[in-house]
């Protein structure tokens, strides 16, 4: 049988002679040269040659493991005399053993990584990886060990994994942000003679909130005119924070001071400044200086850094209110006055009052805005603000007069104010009641006595406090011997009733009834209205069939026989 094992050969042999591989040998070989060894298969006769007498195999060329890691060849042993094989043809392996001819190569020439500042020692930063093309199954040619060439004492690298970690406590981004670390990967397990490669790792410390905001000055002073409307910015304050991004975001607030309710502070998100604004209307005459305590704080706190102290700072803000020449101020925002409609001209209705709010207390004069009183019904005393009538009033024409009064500083006519004045005209009983409509009714010739032929209604332009109370009666001159009667219903209506049985339209076709309507107010007002009654022929249902169109009217306005 064949006597061999697998053969091994070092790659990239550099000697001048052929490289010895091994020996083929059959136990049938008696050493007398009777056997002939034949080699075939991968690279036979080219890469590999055999001494046909001894079975010694040599490699004729420099081999490279990465071209083919294994060569499979066939061996034959033949009896020279008979030409017959003394062993079955068999295969064997020549395995090319790797020499360390490949340096470790990092997967990236430059790595970029970040780690939070102030991180604990041993915090993971990044893992670097180097690969080696040599055979990992043979020797240490591909066994890579990592070490740090540059970047100590700040960082360390795990020799087997390539994991870079922080190595120094309290690395402060605000002190130094960028680090360049050089890592070496060396094969042969890092031993002498190993091949190496390097990579650069650019490490940036990312920000954590380890710095509080700080005001660069303890006191700020701003001025603002008292006329500044709410929302007006007065000034800007800015606390500085050595951190960046959201860790440098600042919220401002007013924590104390006399003007806590008079001012606001808002944060400008772009500049991180605190903008002090007016919250309520200021008044120089009431308060001229405000002192506030403004606080700047970080909204995003990291609890582990609270031991460094409060993440806030405060400053004093002094606000000086500047005097502004202000227009006069009326004692009320509006005035409501009343006057009877029968008031005589020059009757005083009431008065308005305005005062200069400034410390100077400039005198004021009053006037009526004539655009609001075109008919010049009212006037005002320019000195004391008394309002009086300059024309007669009529409630029934206009119930309310809405006028505007102007107060102007005498020394500075540009400073003026206006106030609305609502004047209500009170009712006086100066109108008589009247019929609500023109009444023309009819009566059937065959009408019975006490029949209701018409209901009367009255109207009155006046508006008495207790409501209208009208009374109805026939005029005295028509009351006696009238063919009709008036029945006062005591509800501001009255009925006309027949007074006899039957009417003859041929005798009298039309009656004119004078009715007196009186009100119940003081002084009593009354009027006389006329009701026309026509006598008509009716059917047995009382439906009118024919009437005379006209009546005979006497100069007195009373019809004959009324």
């Amino acid at each position: 049988s064949w006597m061999w094992n697998q053969f091994f050969l070092l790659e990239e042999y550099t000697g001048s002679d052929y490289q010895y591989v091994g020996k083929l040998h059959s136990d049938q070989d008696r050493g007398d040269g009777s056997l002939k060894y034949i080699l075939s298969g991968d690279g036979a006769g080219d890469l590999f040659i055999i001494n046909e007498n001894t079975g010694d195999i040599q490699a004729t060329k420099r081999l490279d493991r990465e071209e083919k890691p294994v060569y499979i060849l066939r061996a034959q042993a033949i009896n020279r005399r008979t030409g017959r094989p003394v062993e079955p043809e068999s295969e064997f392996i020549i395995k090319i053993h790797d020499i360390n001819d490949n340096e470790p190569i990092f997967t990236k020439d430059v790595y970029t990584a970040t780690v939070p500042e102030m991180a604990d020692v041993g915090t993971f930063v990044v893992q670097v990886t180097a690969t080696d093309a040599d055979d990992p199954t043979y020797g240490n040619s591909a066994k890579v060990v990592y070490s740090i060439l540059q970047g100590q004492p700040y960082f360390s690298v795990e020799s087997e994994t390539g994991i870079i970690k922080t190595a120094l406590l309290n690395m402060d981004r605000e002190n130094r942000e960028q680090y360049q670390v050089v890592i070496q990967a060396k094969d042969m397990g890092g031993q002498m003679g190993g091949l190496s490669g390097t990579t650069t790792v650019n490490i940036t410390l990312t920000d954590v909130n380890d710095n509080p905001p700080r005001f660069p000055q303890s006191t700020y002073q701003f001025k603002t005119p008292e006329s500044s409307p709410p929302g007006t910015p007065i000034g800007r304050i800015k606390a500085s924070d050595a951190d960046v991004g959201e860790n440098a975001e600042i919220e401002y607030s007013i924590t104390d001071g006399e003007g806590h309710d008079m001012f606001d502070v808002i944060t400008d998100q772009e500049t991180q400044e605190g903008i002090i604004t007016v919250k309520k209307l200021l008044d120089f005459e009431k308060k001229r200086v405000y002192t506030l305590k403004v606080e700047a704080s970080n909204p995003h706190i990291e609890p582990r850094f609270l031991y460094l102290g409060p993440f806030k700072d405060s400053a004093t803000v002094r606000i000086v209110v500047d005097d502004v020449d202000e227009p006069p101020v009326f004692s009320k925002p509006a005035y409501i006055l009343q006057i009877r409609e029968d008031a005589q001209i020059n009757t005083t209705i009431g008065s308005v009052a305005a005062q200069d709010p400034d410390a100077a207390r400039n005198p004021v004069k009053y006037s009526v805005d004539r655009h609001t009183d075109m008919d010049r019904i009212f006037n005002i005393d320019s000195g004391n603000g008394s309002i009086f009538t300059s024309k007669l009033l009529d409630r029934e024409t206009l119930l309310w007069h809405n006028i505007t009064v102007i107060a102007t500083e005498i020394n500075n006519p540009k400073q003026s104010s206006r106030v609305p004045l609502y004047i209500k005209v009170l009712d006086v009983n100066d109108n008589a009641p009247e019929f609500a409509e023109f009444y023309e009714t009819f009566v059937c010739e065959k009408a019975k006595a006490d029949q209701l032929i018409q209901t009367l209604h009255a109207v009155d332009k006046d508006d008495p406090y207790s409501g209208h109370q009208f009374s109805f009666s026939l005029a005295p001159e028509a009351a006696s011997g009238s063919n009709f009667t008036i029945q006062d219903n005591k509800d501001n209506t009255a009925g006309i009733l027949t007074r006899k049985n039957g009417y003859n339209r041929h005798e009298m076709s039309t009656y004119l009834l004078p009715v007196v309507i009186s009100d119940n107010d003081y002084p009593v007002q009354s009027s006389t209205g006329t009701v026309t009654v026509r006598v008509c022929a009716c059917d047995h249902h009382g439906n009118m069939q024919s009437c005379h169109a006209e009546a005979l009217i006497h100069p007195t306005g009373l019809s004959t026989g009324a």
Epitope: S40, G41, D42, G43, D64, E66, E67, K68, P69, V70, I72, R74, E89, S90, E91, I93, D101, N102, I105, T131, D132, A133, D135, T137
Partner: antibody, heavy 120, light 108 residues
Framework: QVQLLESGGGLVQPGGSLRLSCAAS????????MHWVRQAPGKGLEWVSF????????YYADSVKGRFTISRDNSKNTLYLQMNSLRAEDTAVYYC?????????????WGQGTLVTVSS | DIELTQPPSVSVSPGQTASITCSGD??????VHWYQQKPGQAPVLVIY???NRPSGIPERFSGSNSGNTATLTISGTQAEDEADYYC??????????FGGGTKLTVLG
Amino acid sequence: QVQLLESGGGLVQPGGSLRLSCAASGFTFSSYAMHWVRQAPGKGLEWVSFISSLGSYTYYADSVKGRFTISRDNSKNTLYLQMNSLRAEDTAVYYCARETAGYGYAFDPWGQGTLVTVSS
Amino acid sequence: DIELTQPPSVSVSPGQTASITCSGDNIRKYVVHWYQQKPGQAPVLVIYRDNNRPSGIPERFSGSNSGNTATLTISGTQAEDEADYYCQSWDSFLAVVFGGGTKLTVLG
């Protein structure tokens, strides 16, 4: 001329078995190492298995190890691939290819391929 | 173990030069072979041992291998060169590795 011709492909259920053959002609079959390579539909080439010229040495891709067996019968100039415990992911065209020392141990030539479909 | 990476596709105008890359760590230390596969056909060896042409392969096909990249170059590309191209090398022991393949499109 040098020729390789695969056969034995077809439809088989998951868990089933199939035996592929590759008939060689035009060269001394027993002098060459042989390989099986497969190609899933619309995908790239994937090496499957190797056998040395006399069949003493075999080698397999991890994806088929323990399920597939490569063998050869030099007297019949035929290469085989016995496929057991087939899975849906084994669906592919299977090529046999000759390893040619003269071409730096590259594959030349290749057979036309046989389609194996694993589906229920 | 080596891993071979190819671009999924490359486009070229007729007559222009097409370059298809195959990258892997220290690939220069490995022998690379290239195969051409047209639709419905078996692969064909076009370059062996980095830069050698088998008989019958046109001269416009050439190869190179250095650093981390092996390259198949087709100068004066023709319409019939439109195909999928695969690089291949030996991995550990007796295993073989292929690149993912590159589809070459000849425009026009």
